[in-house]
Interface confidence: medium
């Protein structure tokens, strides 16, 4: 048989198909059911659910679906030693205390096991002091307090609002601040949108709300106590005090009624401008301690949470391709939430469930993809993206060898306004073409592409007439597969207006008020949005599991490496006398920018006209387009983060949600003016450059004709 | 790469005024701290003062010694760092030193310059 | 102000001897942000001084592997392993952790 005829029995089976077959009543279905009770890694009720997805799988149609196992280190608060932050007075009394749990919302009032908010892995500690205001507690809000206004954070509490940057950064620069705590809180300016409700009535944040989640600095670690290395029954593992990623210092997050009371006192410093200024009626100011009558107070944490080597369990499905069965297309995303997961993860889940049983369906009719398709259910992502990492590292070296694509599906909205899509390069012209092959669901646009509702709504800052699609960072399971293997990836949501929604995530985002009614009554009571990212993440799945020559574009990389080196080449400028005085030169970062830009350009028209029907020609053309991501990895790493191998994209060391475009150079000039020795400084940068310079030399060197 | 030369110094009688200029080249000027040293023959180092950057509002701060006296200033434009010297002492004889400092180290010196304060 | 006290005053050596610089202050030199501002200089006659060492114990770049600084608190020490030609001159300390800055009253490297 033919290439074609193997995996198209019938005409009807193409991607129309497979499109037609996805449902949004299918998907609301699947998300009740994946919402009733809490899904938190490493317990019961997770593995009873791993368990479930898996018998599901098979009835679907998939040719083998597994449970892999882990033992990973998890973090859990005392159930009989609750952690709370109290103001005590002089006499050590405690004249208030933060709330010890979330009142859990109408009709889940009798549900067990709900976590009360902490802040995983946290050390145990009772450390008591003044409290220091440190605003977002990013690395410019630190600049501002130390340098600016001569604020010393040494021995201070820091209390710290969310937003704006992942909370494992703000963690680590109190740490390295000197803080002794950190108290995280959500205030109304970032996480309750005017005019909007508060929950049950709306999607804003109440009061006594809070948001969970881990506070590690992993750097693509995996599980803290082997990294590298896959957490099995032989695996050998670290003391807790070399463990990877955990924080030193007692943390914790609380709502912003409890923080009204602890910001209400503040006294000593004035906040420096209305960029530290939340929406609580509170003089922001920053401390260090309370005011006047009020001085002889301090804060005090309890932390007594404990962590442990847990058992997690993901789900791996695999759809067996016909033509070429050993490169891999995968689609992800986690199970495992913090309390009901309404959002996160679980409508993201919802979608990869519709997706498995529609690829069934059509396999049930004797269709199979060109190459394989691997799903999987990932458990503890909420715990440092601990289950995808696990598995990537045992299967490290088929991955490499085999990977063609990943395609993350964590929540499918965190809005209900526009398509959000980050990806590689290479798959801007799939994304693009399918969009435009796609109905919109956005009101207004009836009839209308989901291109032209994309791009209107999100347009381009570069081109017009083309929408927006941003850089992978990280705080996803896609992490490892991008940032350590170098396999193409990419991910698509619904999201909010960023233009008129300022808040940081969605308002609910890992507190117990995320759950089923809040997506059915305020995000998307037709589940429509949630059907049009079903179609975006398996339409993308669809095509690089069967598109013959593979859907991957490699001029676009060009493009985008041209904007990376003259963004940072315009950094670097920023100090010219230094760049003369030790001969700081980006020459050669851009002549191997040209170069590759025209080895692109060749391999495109060699690609657009080679013989389709040879198949080993073909093989040929598609591995170099699978290599090409590949080709990227730098198999040192970066700077103090050997996991983050990729030399164009890494998470930003300020903000693991962000992506940096050539990070190693981004980084050795990063505040480059405060190094004690510029000499040394401004040679890493030269270095860094040459390292940039010599993988894009490379990757564009495996594009070149074979022979 | 970083240079700093002191100018200005000379012989002087007690009570006169004198001033030394440090003109620099190689980094960045206005990114930086800039302080005078001096050194008394046969005597250990004494810091004297130091200027803060624009966004600091070119703040200064002296050593008791010569505080009341002595005046530093910058001009961003020329990359310079001045010392004004008045009501000169004897005790004010040294070899003049500006530094370029980097958070709380003084990385670069100049060669320094002589100031001999005699009748 | 903080008081630094350096010795020996002399340190007669011969090349390719290992020798030792001690440093104390009258106070503790750790900055309440947990660093400590103690660095050593080389000035040789007629020239400005030579950042060596920078907060106890990092090496300035372009000097030798042969010079190490250690210690904390109060006390402090710049070795040289193998004392060669070119590091004869006078050695002095600096403390930035305390204003105003202060400067050990050196140590002479000559040849025994």
């Known amino acids: 048989k033919s290439s074609s005829e193997a995996t198209n029995i019938t005409p009807k089976h193409n991607m129309k198909a497979f499109l037609d077959e996805l449902k949004a009543e299918n998907i609301k279905k699947f998300l009740h059911n994946f919402t009733q009770i809490p899904h938190l890694a490493g317990t019961e009720q997770n593995f009873q659910l791993a368990k479930q997805i898996q018998s599901q799988w098979k009835e679907f149609g998939l040719d083998s679906v597994e449970l892999t196992h882990y033992d990973v280190l998890l973090s859990y608060p005392n159930k009989t030693h609750p952690n709370y932050i109290s103001i005590i007075n002089e006499d050590g009394n405690e004249i208030f205390n933060t709330s010890l749990f979330e009142p859990p919302p109408a009709g889940y009032e009798n549900v067990s096991d709900i976590v009360p908010p902490f802040s995983a892995f946290s050390p145990q500690g009772m450390p008591e002091g003044d409290l220091v205001y440190v605003n977002y507690a990013r690395t410019e809000d630190f600049f501002k307090l130390e340098r600016d206004m001569k604020i010393n954070c040494s021995g201070k509490i820091v209390i710290a609002r969310y937003g704006k940057v992942f909370r494992g950064n703000k963690v680590k620069n109190a740490q390295l601040a000197g803080a002794t705590g950190v108290i995280l809180y959500s205030d109304p300016a970032d996480y309750f949108a005017p005019g909007v409700k508060s929950y049950p009535d709306g999607w804003n944040l109440p009061g006594g709300g809070v948001q969970r989640g881990n506070i590690l600095n992993l750097n693509g670690a995996g599980d803290p106590l082997t990294p590298g290395y896959p957490a099995n029954e032989y695996a050998y593992r670290r003391g807790i005090a070399e463990a990877v990623g955990l924080p030193s210092i007692p943390v914790h997050p609380i709502g912003y009624y409890d923080a009204q009371k602890l910001l209400e006192k503040m006294g000593g410093s004035a906040s420096p401008d209305s960029s530290w200024r939340g929406s609580l009626k509170v003089p922001y100011n920053v401390g260090p301690g309370f005011t006047g009558n009020f001085s002889t107070q301090k804060v005090k944490m309890h932390i007594h949470s404990t962590s442990e080597v847990t058992r997690i369990y993901n789900v791996i499905g695999t759809l067996r391709g016909a033509v070429e069965p050993d490169r891999y297309v995968i689609l992800g995303g986690h199970r495992d939430s913090w309390v009901f997961g309404g959002i996160d993860p679980q409508s993201g889940a919802a979608v990869v469930h519709e997706i498995v049983r529609s690829f069934g369906t059509l396999k049930k009719e004797g269709w199979r993809p060109r190459r394989t398709i691997l799903f999987a259910s990932w458990d503890a992502e909420e715990f440092g993206l601990l289950g995808s990492t696990e598995w990537a590292e045992e299967n490290s070296r088929l991955l490499q060898e085999r990977g063609v694509a990943y395609i993350n599906a964590d929540s499918s909205i965190e809005g209900n306004y526009t398509l959000r899509v980050d990806c590689t390069p290479l798959m801007y012209s799939l994304v693009y073409n399918l969009t435009k092959e796609l109905e919109s669901p956005d009101e207004g646009f009836e009839g209308k592409s989901l291109y032209e509702s994309w791009t209107k709504k999100s347009p381009s800052p570069e081109f017009s007439g083309m929408p927006r699609i941003s850089k992978l960072g990280s705080g996803n399971d896609f992490e490892v597969f991008f940032q350590r293997l170098g396999i193409a990836s990419g991910r698509a949501r619904y999201t909010k207006n960023w233009e008129t929604n300022k808040f940081s995530s969605y308002p609910l985002y890992h507190s117990v008020y995320e759950t089923y009614e809040l997506v059915e009554k305020f995000y998307d009571p037709m589940f429509k949005y949630h059907l049009t990212v079903a179609q975006v993440r398996g339409g993308m799945v669809f095509e690089l599991a069967n598109s013959v020559v593979l859907p991957f574009d490699c001029r676009d990389y060009a493009v985008v490496l041209r904007k990376y080196a003259d963004k940072i080449y315009n950094i670097s400028m920023k100090h010219p006398q230094e760049m003369k005085t030790y001969s700081v030169s980006f020459d050669s970062l851009f002549s191997a920018v040209k170069n590759f830009t025209e080895i692109a350009s060749k391999f495109s028209e060699r690609l657009r006209d080679f013989d389709k029907s040879n198949p080993i020609l073909l093989r040929m053309m598609n591995d170099q387009l699978m290599f090409l991501e590949r080709a990227f990895i730098d198999p040192l790493g970066l700077p103090d983060r050997p996991f983050y191998r990729h030399v164009i994209y890494a998470p930003s060391s300020h903000n693991k949600y962000a992506g940096e475009s050539f990070p190693g150079i981004y980084d050795a000039l990063f505040d480059i003016e405060s190094k004690v020795d510029p000499s040394q400084a401004w040679g890493e940068v030269k270095r860094q450059i040459s390292i940039a310079t010599f993988t894009v030399q490379a990757a564009a060197e495996t594009l070149s004709e074979v022979a | 790469q970083v240079q700093l030369v002191e100018t200005g110094g000379g012989l002087v009688r007690p009570g006169n005024s004198l001033k030394l200029s440090c003109v620099t080249s190689g980094f960045t000027f206005s990114n930086y701290r800039m302080h005078w040293l001096r050194q008394p023959p046969g005597k250990r180092l004494e810091w004297i003062a130091v200027?803060?950057?624009?966004?600091?509002?070119?703040?200064?701060s002296y050593a008791e010694s010569v505080k009341g006296r002595f005046a530093i200033s910058r001009d961003d434009s020329k990359s310079s760092v001045y010392l004004e010297m008045n009501r000169l002492r004897e005790e004010d004889t040294a070899t003049y030193f500006c530094s370029r400092e980097l958070g709380q180290v003084l990385v670069f010196w100049g060669q320094g310059t002589l100031v001999t304060v005699s009748a | 102000d903080v008081v630094v006290t350096q010795t020996p005053l002399s340190l007669p050596v011969s090349l390719g001897d290992q020798a030792s610089i001690s440093c104390r202050s009258s106070q503790s030199l750790v900055h309440s942000y947990g660093n400590t501002y103690l660095h050593w200089y080389l000035q040789k006659p007629g020239q400005s001084p030579k950042l060596l060492i920078y907060k106890v114990s990092n090496r300035f770049s372009g000097v030798p592997d042969r010079f190490s600084g250690s210690g904390s608190g109060t006390d402090f020490t710049l070795k040289i392993s193998r004392v060669e030609a070119e590091d004869l001159g006078v050695y002095f300390c600096s403390q930035t952790t305390h204003v105003p800055w202060t400067f050990g009253g050196g140590t002479k490297l000559e040849i025994k």
């Open positions: 200027i803060t950057v624009k966004s600091d509002n070119y703040g200064s």
